[in-house]
């Protein structure tokens, strides 16, 4: 269930906001990747 987020707090697919502050932690996207020449390559 890949969801890509704008910095605004919107999710691209359905524009659902993180409305309640208590949900901030559970809606942070984890970034797992390898830095190669200044570019992050997803692993």
């Amino acid at each position: 269930d890949a969801e890509f987020r704008h910095d605004s707090g919107y999710e691209v697919h359905h524009q659902k906001l993180v409305f309640f502050a208590e949900d901030v932690g559970s809606n942070k996207g984890a970034i797992i990747g390898l830095m190669v020449g200044g570019v992050v390559i997803a692993c």
Epitope: D1, E3, G9, E11, H14, K16, L17, V18, F19, F20, A21, E22, D23, V24, S26, N27
Partner: antibody, heavy 112, light 112 residues
Framework: EVQLVESGGGLVQPGGSLRLSCAAS????????MSWVRQAPGKGLELVAQ????????YYPDTVKGRFTISRDNAKNTLYLQMNSLRAEDTAVYYC?????WGQGTLVTVSS | DVVMTQSPLSLPVTLGQPASISCRSS???????????LHWFLQKPGQSPRLLIY???NRFSGVPDRFSGSGSGTDFTLKISRVEAEDVGVYYC?????????FGQGTKVEIK
């Protein structure tokens, strides 16, 4: 498209019970806190229950504490409100809300 | 609970003229992430509330740019640059920084 659809409202006698349901779609339901908000005729918005994303924490105002129970089934993308020992003053339109999105509301009328 | 106080409670407006609603919270709405979770809703007669402005100053999807929000800490303002006929209804400020979610009393905007 985000949608919240309530059901289960109706006419009930004082002291009776009702169970409201809210079917959610268009977003990852399990990641978001949800609430039930009511509005008595001609009045403002009143939160009656709030539940966190995983269902481990709930909040009720004193007006409904001990009588109402909020729960959720994240596998079914559904929010519930069990209402017991209903009183005339519980008469209102009940909305399911994720904050940014609200359902159409379901009318609960408590009367003999 | 965080108490939200709106003023005025009734606002007669002239079409094409600006309008402003104030909202004050009983405690700071700044969350640990640096954001204030202060929002504005509009409820038109017979409809569910709909989100206009989220996190103080961000217009929600589809909201006209004549609506703007500002403020910080405990004092916030909603402004309509030029009121249109479709803007009539009850405006609510709301905070979701702290549990429980709380609402202002509502400001009824009507055309003079």
């Amino acid at each position: 498209e985000v949608q919240l659809v309530e059901s289960g409202g109706g006419l009930v006698q004082p002291g009776g019970s009702l169970r409201l349901s809210c079917a959610a779609s268009g977003f990852t339901f399990s990641r978001y806190s949800m609430s039930w908000v009511r509005q008595a005729p001609g009045k403002g918005l009143e939160l009656v229950a709030q539940i966190n994303s995983v269902g481990t924490s709930t909040y009720y105002p004193d007006t409904v504490k001990g009588r109402f129970t909020i729960s959720r089934d994240n596998a079914k993308n559904t929010l519930y409100l069990q209402m017991n020992s209903l009183r005339a003053e519980d008469t209102a339109v009940y909305y399911c809300a994720s904050g940014d999105y609200w359902g159409q509301g379901t009318l609960v009328t408590v009367s003999s | 609970d965080v108490v939200m106080t709106q003023s005025p409670l009734s606002l007669p407006v002239t079409l094409g003229q600006p309008a402003s609603i104030s909202c004050r919270s009983s405690q700071s709405l700044i969350y640990s992430d640096g954001n204030a979770y202060l929002h504005w809703f509009l409820q038109k007669p017979g409809q569910s509330p709909r989100l206009l402005i989220y996190k103080v100053s961000n217009r929600f999807s589809g909201v006209p740019d004549r609506f703007s929000g500002s403020g910080s800490g405990t004092d916030f303002t909603l402004k309509i640059s030029r009121v249109e006929a479709e803007d009539v209804g009850v405006y609510y400020c709301s905070q979701s920084t702290h549990v429980p979610w709380t609402f202002g009393q509502g400001t009824k905007v009507e055309i003079k």
